[in-house]
Amino acid sequence: SYSMEHFRWGKPVGKKRRPVKVYPNGAEDESAEAFPLEF
């Protein structure tokens, strides 16, 4: 739930985190986001 989120100029502020992109193939222009596991 993002009920605690507040938006200003369309950007999330507060406690929503922004994961760092993963580039598993090194020199290739690909990124693999690590999606949270489903519990």
Partner: antibody, heavy 110, light 112 residues
Framework: QSVEESGGRLVTPGTPLTLTCTVS????????MIWVRQAPGKGLESIGI?????DTYYASWAKGRFTISQTSTTVDLKIISPTTEDTATYFC???????WGQGTLVTVSS | DVVMTQTPASVEAAVGGTVTIKCQAS??????LAWYQQKTGQPPKLLIY???TLASGVPSRFKGSGSGTEFTLTISDLECADAATYYC??????????????FGGGTEVVVK
Amino acid sequence: QSVEESGGRLVTPGTPLTLTCTVSGFSLSKYDMIWVRQAPGKGLESIGIIYDDGDTYYASWAKGRFTISQTSTTVDLKIISPTTEDTATYFCVKGVSNIWGQGTLVTVSS
Amino acid sequence: DVVMTQTPASVEAAVGGTVTIKCQASQSISNYLAWYQQKTGQPPKLLIYSASTLASGVPSRFKGSGSGTEFTLTISDLECADAATYYCQSYEGSSSSSYGVGFGGGTEVVVK
């Protein structure tokens, strides 16, 4: 694709220093970049991140001590007022990946 | 900030043996966890991301597991080349109130 850090040198405490990470083979507008440092014989320490859209975030201990900025081909790390505790090898890293530079050594000593 | 606590600081095992390294996050990071290997004088090498996915070219002797706050790296069939320092890294990312990109203190693996 590669990154290369430069600008490390011997400085006296309190003398601002800017380190530069030059990237080749990719555009910074698409990628997240992290600055990491490693004091001699110690572990890795994350300083801060600049996201693909230019947003920057810093570790709590690094706020007010460092600033990160970027151009189209470089990411700069400014050490605002170095202390002897900032003596370390500084790395820039493309997100979570094997794209690390060899690092640049900063020595802070009077 | 997310704080990563890694244990043990050092571990010794024989060639062909197995070592287990644990990493604990101060808050849940889901599976946003990477493992790196660093040898003296070299930058770190990515081994595992998403807690359990092997990076390109990494042998299957390396296994990552865990989610939430508890993570484990297991190295089996140890080789001399595995002697290095291993680091866990959270990359859950950052918010205006907390920095989420942190490393564990490292574990030195000595192979006898």
